[in-house]
């Protein structure tokens, strides 16, 4: 098939970091710069991704692969391919549309991205704070209340006695 | 081409003021919403301002009200008026095109200025 395909399609011998130019019957070009082939028999370049503002250049255009992006510092990527930058913000703090501001009291945000989340309910659990939250941690739930009562061991009782005359299985 | 040519920048003293221009081309500008951007000496970016295409306003804490953003869809300018400068406002200041319409995010096929350089100092 690929044999009968090249006789059919000249382009299909065409390698990638080239373009089958049909303006000049069909000879296979290499592509222009700023732009690649990944692939063999194309008809057309690519142009290249440029890294703009925001975003810095990791890895540069070659004529057979595309550049590809990271962020500057201060800003994370964010979708396929770091197709966006998001402005980074300090723990405690989460990016709202007046930029950075202090997670509010009974939420905390332990990254420089995302948002702030409510603290966690120890009580739900049955369990008390052992150490308050603050804008950048979540509380740590401790034992019960009814654990820490006075009187109250966290030593495992002794087993009862077993009743006289009845010999172990 | 889409070609974004900020100008206005230089050297001011600590509570002067600056107005900033941005001149574009090559795209709808009237429709675009558009932001400004900073990048202090030995700093990563920092978003500034933001301007819908309706005219609604969006400021970073450090700087509301003392810098003011607005448009002229007339001219295709976009301006950022800058008073009571301060030294830690010293940076060079980008236009950009702002198609996430969220604050502090821009998207890989936005557009950007060469900036131009603000430095407040006696």
């Known amino acids: 098939f690929e044999r009968t395909r090249s006789l059919q399609d000249p382009c299909s011998n065409c390698p990638a970091g080239t373009f089958c130019d049909n303006n000049r019957n069909q000879i296979c070009s290499p592509c222009p710069p700023n732009s690649f082939s990944s692939a063999g028999g194309q008809r057309t370049c690519d142009i290249c991704r440029q890294c703009k503002g925001v975003f810095r250049t990791r890895k540069e255009c070659s004529s057979t692969s595309n550049a590809e992006c990271d962020c500057t510092p201060g800003f994370h990527c964010l979708g396929a391919g770091c197709s966006m930058c998001e402005q980074d913000c300090k723990q405690g703090q989460e990016l709202t549309k007046k930029g950075c501001k202090d997670c509010c009291f009974g939420t905390f945000n332990d990254q420089k991205r995302g948002i702030c989340r409510p603290w966690t309910n120890c009580s739900l659990d049955g369990k008390s704070v052992l150490v308050n939250g603050t804008k950048e941690r979540d509380v740590v739930c401790g034992p019960s209340p009814a654990d820490l009562s006075p009187g109250a061991s966290s030593v495992t009782p002794p087993a009862p006695a077993r009743e006289p005359g009845h010999s172990p299985q | 081409e889409v070609q974004l040519v900020e100008s206005g920048g230089g050297l001011v003293q600590p509570g002067g003021s600056l107005r900033l221009s941005c001149a574009a081309s090559?795209?709808?500008?009237?429709?675009?919403?558009m932001s400004w951007a900073r990048q202090a000496p030995g700093k990563g970016f920092e978003w500034v301002s933001s301007?819908?295409?309706?005219?609604?306003?969006y400021y970073v804490e450090s700087v509301k009200g003392r810098f003011t953003i607005s448009r002229d869809n007339a001219k295709n300018s976009l301006y950022l008026q800058m008073s009571s400068l301060r030294a830690e406002d010293t940076a060079v200041y980008y236009c950009?095109?702002?198609?996430?319409?969220?604050?502090?995010?821009?998207?890989?096929?936005?557009?950007w200025g060469q900036g131009t350089l603000v430095t407040v100092s006696s």
């Open positions: 950009a095109t702002w198609k996430t319409l969220r604050v502090g995010v821009w998207d890989e096929s936005d557009y």
């Open positions: 090559g795209f709808t500008f009237s429709s675009s919403a």
């Open positions: 301007i819908y295409s309706s005219g609604k306003t």
